[in-house]
Structure formats: structure tokens, C-alpha cells
Interface confidence: low
């Protein structure tokens, strides 16, 4: 399923994007899954749909639940699910794990902390930043656009960083906060030619016609923060988005950092309702960084149903 977890705090704005993409010209309908009730598009409502975005202005704990978005084009529909949880504000300073966005790590050279989800909102500078609930002060801290830069990073700079900003909707202002952990790496990172862990080169993957199939492209690029590293799938040498087959989609997996400190990425290719013609395609897992590009090719073959004898 194309499902995405989203969370927010009561009385703050929360904006959720449909996990299925489509052209701006496509219409997107939103429903509350439990009741199948359509979400209104009129902006006077506290919860309303605006194209690919679902807006809670402000959010309430009772808004928690699963929301369905359907991207409609002239030739196909794509369905996604947004699993929304709204939490009560904490009275103490601690931010619970379930409210934390992904951890970022920095080093002396690279100490940017991006404010999570901010791109979804209509906000204006400046951003306010807090560390462990204390407002950040001093010349070492610079709020720049949607991120915080810390000069001369030290190990003591590790901790939970919260960004706070104001979302403006038709003249009304709503507060938004988002928190993520920042860790400091002592050792110097390095970058190397991409190493694809999966799939194996020229792998044959068995699939069943009519069933769903997933292919994972996983690669490692070095240690520490990587500048410009990517994994992606291509079909017959064409980007997935350009291939034009809505049954076949790619979805970013988790950024991984293994115990040995290697920075790895993966991209999952999801094929819905496998068809005969899918067996004729060439599936390329590409891993790319500044050193170059590595490609592993996969082909699909039909899995023969096993005869079950009693």
C-alpha cells in the first residue's frame, strides 16, 4: 500500500501530502477512511482538502485516523493513504519518540539541520529554533531559510532540535513545531564508488502473474554525510516517472546507516498486478554519486505454481 505516517500536535497546523503523485492538473479527492466521508474543499472548514494537500487548521486529537486520497487522471486512478495521528501537547520539555522526525547527523564541515515538513507550509522567515526546549542564542547558531547552521560543531551540540514557524492561510496564522535529533560524528566521512548490495547483477526474480511484486535497489556510498547520492530504478532505460505505467511505482526506502557507519540508500520498485508484458522489461537498479554510476540489471520470470499432492 502507498501509505504515509503523519503526525502533529493539537491546536497546531498540520498539512499532509497525498503519498501518490500526479500531475498538477490531476484532481485529488480525499476521504476519511473510517466513514468513507468526503473531505470538503472549502477553505472555511477547519479540515479541508486542497489538491494533493490535506490541511488541518488547526488539528484536533479527534482528527486522528486514516485518510484516503485518490489521484484521478483521464486514464487511471491512484489511491494513497495518510495515517494521521494528532497528539496532545506535552506539559514537560521532553519530546516523545513518536513525535520525532528522522535523526540527522553532522560534522565540523556539515552541520545543517533542516526543519522537517516545512516545505508543505506557507511560512515566512525567521524560523525559531530550540535545543532541548531552550531557545538557541549566540553567533554560532544561524537560522538560514528552512535550516539551522551550527558553526564549529562540538559533541555537546548533539540533542533534540525543534523548529517553530507560523503557517499563514488566508490571513490566519497557525503555529507549527517539528523536532528531530541531531548527532555529531567524530570521525571524518568519506565517499566511494557506489556499491550495490541488492539486487545481484543480472538477477532473475520469480514473480506470479496477477500478484504484486517488490524489487529493492539498495546501495552504499561511503561513511558519513553523502553529498549527492541516489538510488533509482529505470525501466528499459527510462525513468519510472517517464515510463507511464501507473502500476509500476518507485518508493524511497529508509536511509540506512549500518553499525559499520556505512551510508546506504534503498529504493523499492512496486509492481501491482504483474502482467505478462512486465516479464519482457529490463529493470535497472542505478546507484549514483559523484564518483560515478553503477547499474545492476534484473529480469522477471514467471514462477511456476507448485503442484500440491496430498
Amino acid at each position: 500500500k502507498f501509505s504515509k505516517q503523519s503526525w502533529g500536535l493539537e491546536n497546531e497546523a498540520l498539512i499532509v501530502r497525498c503519498p501518490r503523485q500526479g500531475k498538477p492538473s490531476y484532481t485529488v479527492d480525499w476521504y476519511y477512511s473510517q466513514t468513507n466521508k468526503s473531505i470538503p474543499t472549502q477553505e472555511r472548514n477547519r479540515v479541508f482538502a486542497s489538491g494533493q494537500l490535506l490541511k488541518f487548521l488547526p488539528a484536533a486529537v479527534a482528527d486522528s485516523g486514516i485518510y484516503t486520497c485518490i489521484v484521478r487522471s483521464p486514464t487511471f486512478n491512484r489511491t494513497g493513504y495518510a495515517n494521521v495521528t494528532i497528539y496532545k501537547k506535552q506539559s514537560d520539555c521532553n519530546v516523545p519518540d513518536y513525535l520525532m522526525y528522522s535523526t540527522v547527523s553532522g560534522s565540523e564541515k556539515n552541520s545543517k539541520i533542516y526543519c522537517p515538513t516545512i516545505d508543505l507550509y506557507n511560512w515566512t522567515a525567521p524560523l525559531e529554533w530550540f535545543k532541548n526546549c531552550q531557545a538557541l542564542q549566540g553567533s554560532r547558531y544561524r537560522a538560514h531559510k528552512s535550516f539551522l547552521v551550527i558553526d564549529n560543531v562540538m559533541t555537546e551540540d548533539a540533542g533534540d532540535y525543534t523548529c517553530k514557524f507560523i503557517h499563514n492561510e488566508n490571513g490566519a496564522n497557525y503555529s507549527v513545531t517539528a523536532t528531530r535529533s541531531f548527532t555529531v560524528k567524530d570521525e571524518q566521512g568519506f565517499s566511494l564508488f557506489p556499491v550495490i548490495g541488492a539486487p545481484a547483477q543480472n538477477e532473475i526474480k520469480e514473480v506470479e502473474i496477477g500478484k504484486n511484486a517488490n524489487l529493492t535497489c539498495s546501495a552504499c556510498f561511503g561513511k558519513g554525510t553523502q553529498f549527492l547520492a541516489a538510488v533509482l530504478w529505470q525501466l528499459n532505460g527510462t525513468k519510472i516517472t517517464d515510463f507511464g505505467e501507473p502500476r509500476i511505482q518507485q518508493e524511497e526506502g529508509q536511509n540506512q546507516s549500518f553499525s559499520n557507519g556505512l551510508a546506504c540508500l534503498d529504493m523499492v520498485l512496486r509492481i501491482a498486478d504483474v502482467k505478462e508484458e512486465d516479464l519482457l522489461l529490463q529493470y535497472d537498479c542505478l546507484a549514483l554519486n559523484l564518483h560515478g554510476l553503477r547499474r545492476h540489471t534484473v529480469r522477471l520470470s514467471r514462477k511456476n505454481p507448485i503442484d500440491h499432492h496430498s
Partner: antibody, heavy 124, light 108 residues
Framework: QVQLVQSGAEVKKPGSSVKVSCKAS????????VSWVRQAPGQGLEWMGR????????NYAQKFQGRVTITADESTSTAYMELSSLRSEDTAVYYC?????????????????WGQGTLVTVSS | EIVMTQSPATLSVSPGERATLSCRAS???????LAWYQQKPGQAPRLLIY???TRATGIPARFSGSGSGTEFTLTISSLQSEDFAVYYC?????????FGQGTKLEIK
């Protein structure tokens, strides 16, 4: 450090074709897109198209579609731009440029490296 | 195609002063795909800023970029004599990549 070295100036008759080369050294030629950008005398920059050698992918600006062909030879790290049916308004300096970077979102097509330019004069 | 419009066409500023150049896109462009170039007569363009605000290697700190959506700005904080040139913005958000028509920065 990537260096792009282009072929020399050309004088061509209207209706003919010109093929300009761009040899790369000092970088991973295959991975980076090579774009062609032209500049008519006293005018601004105009993107014509690009090739991503390792993916054998080309894209062209609509204006030049059908008249321009961009190719690449990975073995010599050389890109080529051929423009046919030349007319006087094609008189310009033609640059090759690279440095754009591909990731899962698409192309960050900024050009860090430029050739020295090739003047193509179309005159009868 | 996305049309990039630069203003002003010509900007006259004295050395040591601040120069602000504008670039407007005909439709929204993700800031990751916006670059600025400097070009001097008889030379190839030179990349100054990419990703709307990141300085390219070797570019002095007096050059800075900002903006998002359809409005982008290149600022030169204290003009040096070598900064007088033509400046172009460029988007690579969608094909065809397009450049602005250029802003000529001249000595006042």
C-alpha cells in the same frame, strides 16, 4: 577538475550541417549530462539539448527538435552536437557544458564546467 | 516551457555598493533547480550559485542567492571591479532548461 575542450571555429553555407565536438577530461564523463548552449552575437544564452552518456538519454529544446542531434562516444569521452539545415540566424558561439547531476528526483541541471565555445558562422 | 524574466536589464552601481538582481519564473520552480551565472565579454559563463543559494566552488562570499517559488534574487554585497559583467539565471526544473535574458551590471 573536469575540462571541456571544443573543436575549432566553422564557416558554413546556409542549408548545410555542422558538427561540433566536446572532449571531456578529468571527470566521470558517463555520469554527468553534457548540454549544448548557444549564444548569438550580443544575445543571451539558449539551451539546445543534452545527453546523459551512460543512460544514452537525450533531450532537446522544442525549437531545435528535428534539426539537432546530440551524441556521445564514451570510449573517447567526447560529446557531439550536429545542427542541420543551417540558416544565417544560427550564427552563434556554441558551448558544451556539464556538471548537472542526476538523482531520484530528476536532474539538477546546473553547469559547473563549460567548454571554451565554438564560433559557427553561417554565410553564403 | 518555463520563461525566466530578469530585471533590470541593466543595473548601474558604484564599486563597493550592493547590487540586487531579480529573476522571476513564469511558474513555480523548486529552488534545488535554480542557478546563477556570470559572463564576461569573450568568455564562457561561470557558475556562481546553484540550488538558489549554494555558492559554487571558488565563488567569493560577497555573492549570495535567495528566493523560492517564482521569485529569486542574486545579491552582490560589495561590488568589486571584476564583478561588472552580465548575469544570467537558469532553471532546470523542467525541460527545456531555460535562461533569463540577462542583467548587465555596469559601473556607475
Amino acid at each position: 577538475q573536469v575540462q571541456l575542450v571544443q573543436s575549432g571555429a566553422e564557416v558554413k553555407k546556409p542549408g548545410s550541417s555542422v558538427k561540433v565536438s566536446c572532449k571531456a577530461s578529468g571527470g566521470t564523463f558517463s555520469t554527468f549530462g553534457v548540454s549544448w548552449v548557444r549564444q548569438a552575437p550580443g544575445q543571451g544564452l539558449e539551451w539546445m539539448g543534452r545527453i546523459i552518456p551512460i543512460l544514452a538519454t537525450t533531450n532537446y529544446a522544442q525549437k531545435f527538435q528535428g534539426r539537432v542531434t546530440i551524441t556521445a562516444d564514451e570510449s573517447t569521452s567526447t560529446a557531439y552536437m550536429e545542427l542541420s539545415s543551417l540558416r544565417s540566424e544560427d550564427t552563434a558561439v556554441y558551448y558544451c557544458a556539464s556538471g548537472d547531476y542526476y538523482d531520484s528526483s530528476g536532474y539538477y541541471g546546473y553547469f559547473q564546467h563549460w567548454g571554451q565555445g565554438t564560433l559557427v558562422t553561417v554565410s553564403s | 516551457e518555463i520563461v525566466m524574466t530578469q530585471s533590470p536589464a541593466t543595473l548601474s552601481v558604484s564599486p563597493g555598493e550592493r547590487a540586487t538582481l531579480s529573476c522571476r519564473a513564469s511558474q513555480s520552480v523548486s529552488s534545488s533547480y535554480l542557478a546563477w551565472y556570470q559572463q564576461k565579454p569573450g568568455q564562457a559563463p561561470r557558475l556562481l550559485i546553484y540550488g538558489a543559494s549554494t555558492r559554487a566552488t571558488g565563488i567569493p562570499a560577497r555573492f549570495s542567492g535567495s528566493g523560492s517559488g517564482t521569485e529569486f534574487t542574486l545579491t552582490i554585497s560589495s561590488l568589486q571591479s571584476e564583478d561588472f559583467a552580465v548575469y544570467y539565471c537558469q532553471q532546470s526544473y523542467s525541460i527545456p532548461f531555460t535562461f533569463g535574458q540577462g542583467t548587465k551590471l555596469e559601473i556607475k
